[in-house]
Interface confidence: low
């Protein structure tokens, strides 16, 4: 099932996946001035059994110009600096992600794709959150957002994060004004079943990560 | 679910220009990729014009480049078509349309492609 909506967004903050749920797609998207192959994957869909999971398809760009440059190549350091994306979308390892069965690692960059990413993720994928630059975070709880199924509906949880400017002394923990969450009451009040399958070990590998998840993102 | 809504039609004279605008609501806009269609009376629903979801690619129908331009606000989850030079034969009902489908500068967009449909707003260019 997709989730119908993107992760929550956070003031001064971006969401990494540490790995994708198998389901999950990734658009085949190119930069300005190139486009995707005739006959080329619109996504890479990520499939698998019950040992291995990858991705399904390649994506592949071509000059806008010409017809026959078909090459899918990991681009150069120079080239990767082009990739400025605001949701920190980069292949990312940090910790051996076979361990988590079902789920497949980032995808490499192809030549020429887009600036920016675009997942759609599935119901139990969990995002991490991070600050940006020049801004610290204060945590009331987990900076991280699952998307859940409820009621029939899909929805993000909302991660308990704040990030504040450097310079900003004048809020604490202890003086944030509470986030309304995505329903407006608290998580612990809705009455439905929520299925959480794998949550609980994504959760304990997520522990794992926390000082080396957002280390290589592109420049 | 996404909702559109379309906005912007009306009467025209041949030679003006109208900006067409279709507001989304539900579900996930800022992946979806947007275009506009058009419906003349008595004829095929056709592509007018797309945009991605990154801006980074936009396609136009030969009949209308140079005088269409499609635009996108994320942020306030809107597309617009902005439609100068008008002439009797853009006579129709416009429709937006959005999806989750990558656009692809080498084919055209059909209207199958796209799942989501606002109900249409009607332009009309008299001579």
């Known amino acids: 099932e997709l989730c119908d909506d993107d992760p929550p967004e956070i003031p001064h903050a971006t969401f990494k996946a540490m790995a994708y749920k198998e389901g999950t797609m990734l658009n085949c998207e190119c930069k300005r001035g190139f486009r995707r192959i005739k006959s080329g994957s619109l996504y890479m869909l990520c499939t698998g059994n019950s040992s291995h999971s990858s991705w399904d398809n390649q994506c592949q760009c071509t000059s806008s110009a010409t017809r026959n440059t078909t090459k899918q190549v990991t681009p150069q350091p120079e080239e990767q600096k082009e990739r400025k994306t605001t949701e920190m979308q980069s292949p990312m390892q940090p910790v051996d992600q076979a361990s988590l069965p079902g789920h497949c690692r980032e995808p490499p960059p192809w030549e020429n794709e887009a600036t920016e990413r675009i997942y759609h993720f599935v119901v139990g994928q969990m995002v991490y959150y991070q600050c940006v630059q020049g801004y610290r975070a204060l945590h009331r709880g987990p900076a991280e957002s699952v998307c859940k199924m409820t009621h029939g509906k899909t929805r993000w949880t909302q991660p308990q994060l704040i990030c504040t400017g450097e310079m900003e002394t004048s809020q604490f923990p202890g003086e944030e004004k509470p986030q309304a969450s995505p329903e407006g009451r608290p998580e612990s009040e809705t009455s439905c079943l929520v299925t959480t399958t794998d949550f609980q070990i994504q959760t304990e590998m997520a522990a794992t990560m926390e000082t080396s998840i957002f280390t290589t993102e592109y420049q | 679910q996404v909702q559109l809504v379309e906005s912007g039609g009306g009467l025209v004279q041949a030679g003006g220009s109208l900006r067409l605008s279709c507001a989304a609501s539900?579900?996930?806009?800022?992946?979806?990729?947007m275009g506009w269609f058009r419906r003349a009376p008595g004829k095929e629903r056709e592509f007018v014009a797309a945009v991605s979801w990154s801006v980074d690619n936009k396609l136009y129908a030969g009949s209308v480049k140079g005088r269409f331009t499609i635009s996108r606000d994320n942020g306030r989850n809107m597309v617009y078509l902005q439609m100068n030079s008008l002439k009797p034969e853009d006579t129709a009902v416009y429709y937006c349309a959005a999806d989750n489908i990558p656009l692809s500068s080498d084919m055209r967009p059909t209207a199958t492609e796209f799942g989501y449909w606002g109900q249409g707003t009607r332009v009309t260019v008299s001579s």
């Open positions: 539900g579900g996930t806009f800022r992946t979806r990729n």
